[in-house]
Every structure is written in C-alpha cells, then in structure tokens.
C-alpha cells in the first residue's frame, strides 16, 4: 500500500522559518501534490502550494518556495512573519495524487519539544483515499 510521509523542520538560524518535507512511498507516478495547513485538503485545511511534476508550482503566502526534491518528494519553505510562531503548533498535510489510480494524504507537525534545526520524526497519520 502506498504511503505518504511528512516531516516539519524549524530552521536553526531563523526561528521564523520552517520547511515541510513530504514524500510518496509506493509504485506509480505522481500527477499532483497539494500541501495544506490546519488540516487535510478539503477538510478545513488551507492550501499552501500545489506542485505539478512537469507544469510547475503554485504557492500562496506564507509559502516562500515550493520545489521537487526527487520524483516522489517535495519541500515547501515557509516564512512566519508574525511575532509568535503559529507554525510550531500547526498540522501540515501533503496529498499525493496519481490520476486516476488514487490519492494518498498524510499529516505531520513539529513536536513541541523540537530543538531548532531538528526534523520531526516521520510519524505520518495516513488518510487513505481510493478515488
């Protein structure tokens, strides 16, 4: 069964900067990736970025840079402009779509005890969808 992993990382040099890393483990080619925060896509989450493997990326503030790391993983840099850091307690979700086979989504967050620069362990909460 395909799986999605999510890691959230706080930058050591800038505590207001976060990076979300997401990857797809499974067969098949990815046709679209959507990244949201505050919950899963279509279930209360707010869209941060959409990435197409060939046609490019689209992103919305506070997303700073969305890019492909490999054919099956992406990263999204976020800039927190607020005085406090709401990202620290936020859930980030990534949905990998393989049209028309199906889509797979997982969510993760930065553990409250995380030190700057350390990645959150890959403990995804899988939300499996059979489209």
């Amino acid at each position: 069964t395909p799986e999605v992993w999510v890691q959230v990382q706080m930058e050591a040099t800038e505590l207001s900067s976060f990076t979300v890393h997401c990857g797809f483990l499974g067969p098949g080619s990815i046709s679209l990736v959507t990244v949201s925060w505050g919950g899963p896509d279509g279930a209360g989450g707010t869209k941060l970025a959409v990435l197409h493997p060939e046609l490019g990326t689209r992103q919305w503030a506070p997303a700073r840079q969305a890019r492909w790391e490999t054919q099956s993983s992406i990263s999204l840099a976020l800039e927190d402009s607020g005085a406090s850091s709401p990202f620290a307690n936020t859930t980030f979700c990534c949905k990998f779509a393989s049209f028309p086979e199906g889509s797979w989504e997982s969510c993760g967050s930065l553990p409250p005890s995380s030190d700057p620069g350390l990645s959150a362990p890959p403990t995804p909460v899988p939300i499996l969808r059979a489209d």
């Epitope: 490019g56 779509a97 889509s103």
Partner: nanobody, 121 residues
Framework: EVQLVESGGGLVQPGGSLRLSCAAS????????MGWFRQAPGKGLDEGVA????????KYADSVKGRFTISRDNAKNSLYLQMNSLRAEDTAVYYC??????????????WGQGTQVTVSS
C-alpha cells in the same frame, strides 16, 4: 471531503449521443478548474477532453472539438458533458475532475470513479 460522482455513460452506436453528468458534494475544494478526462482501454490517460476554469474559459481536446460541449450548473454543483457524433475512438472511461490550472491546462486534484462510455455497433 470532495466527492465527485459521474453518471450517464453507456453503450451507444456510432453517430449517437450521450450526456454525462457529474455531481459534486462536500465541495470545499479550492481549485480553479473542472473538467472531463478519459482513459481508453489499454491506453494512457488523455489530456483534458474538455475543461472549464473559474473564469469560464473552456478548452477542448482537438479530437472532440465541434462534437463535445462542456457546461456547468453552479447552483446544482454539477458539471456536464454533451457528446454528439460519437465515434469508436471515443470509447473510454470518462472521469470528472476538479483541479488546478498550470499554463492553461487543468490538472486533476480530485476525481470520481469514472463512467464507461462504449461506442459500438
């Protein structure tokens, strides 16, 4: 949760017509386009057969221009595809999808289970 349910497929003779419908529910989707895509037996997925974006811009694949018409009813949260002058090569599973535009092309993010269209005498 976005749910898209297609209907209206079936068996039709060459030259005949069909009207596909797609009902959307739980529609909190924030994309900017919807459309119809198809996958023929033993073949890869076609680029959008017919797509429409939030501004109402419509795009058809060359192979269906003049024969297929896409429309939507926002009040009913529905998408339609009127297919006329059907040909054997139109035989495929047709998917209703909601997605995002990249360079004018609609890329699916959510889609239904598909409905089979078979054109044969």
């Amino acid at each position: 949760e976005v749910q898209l349910v297609e209907s209206g497929g079936g068996l039709v003779q060459p030259g005949g017509s069909l009207r596909l419908s797609c009902a959307a529910s739980g529609f909190t989707f924030s994309g900017d386009c919807m459309g119809w895509f198809r996958q023929a037996p033993g073949k890869g997925l076609d680029e959008g057969v017919a797509t429409i974006d939030n501004a109402g811009r419509i795009k058809y694949a060359d192979s269906v221009k003049g024969r297929f018409t896409i429309s939507r009813d926002n009040a009913k949260n529905s998408l339609y595809l009127q297919m006329n002058s059907l040909r054997a090569e139109d035989t495929a599973v047709y998917y209703c999808a909601a997605g995002w535009t990249f360079g004018g092309q609609c890329s699916p993010a959510d889609w239904g289970q598909g409905t089979q269209v078979t054109v044969s005498s």
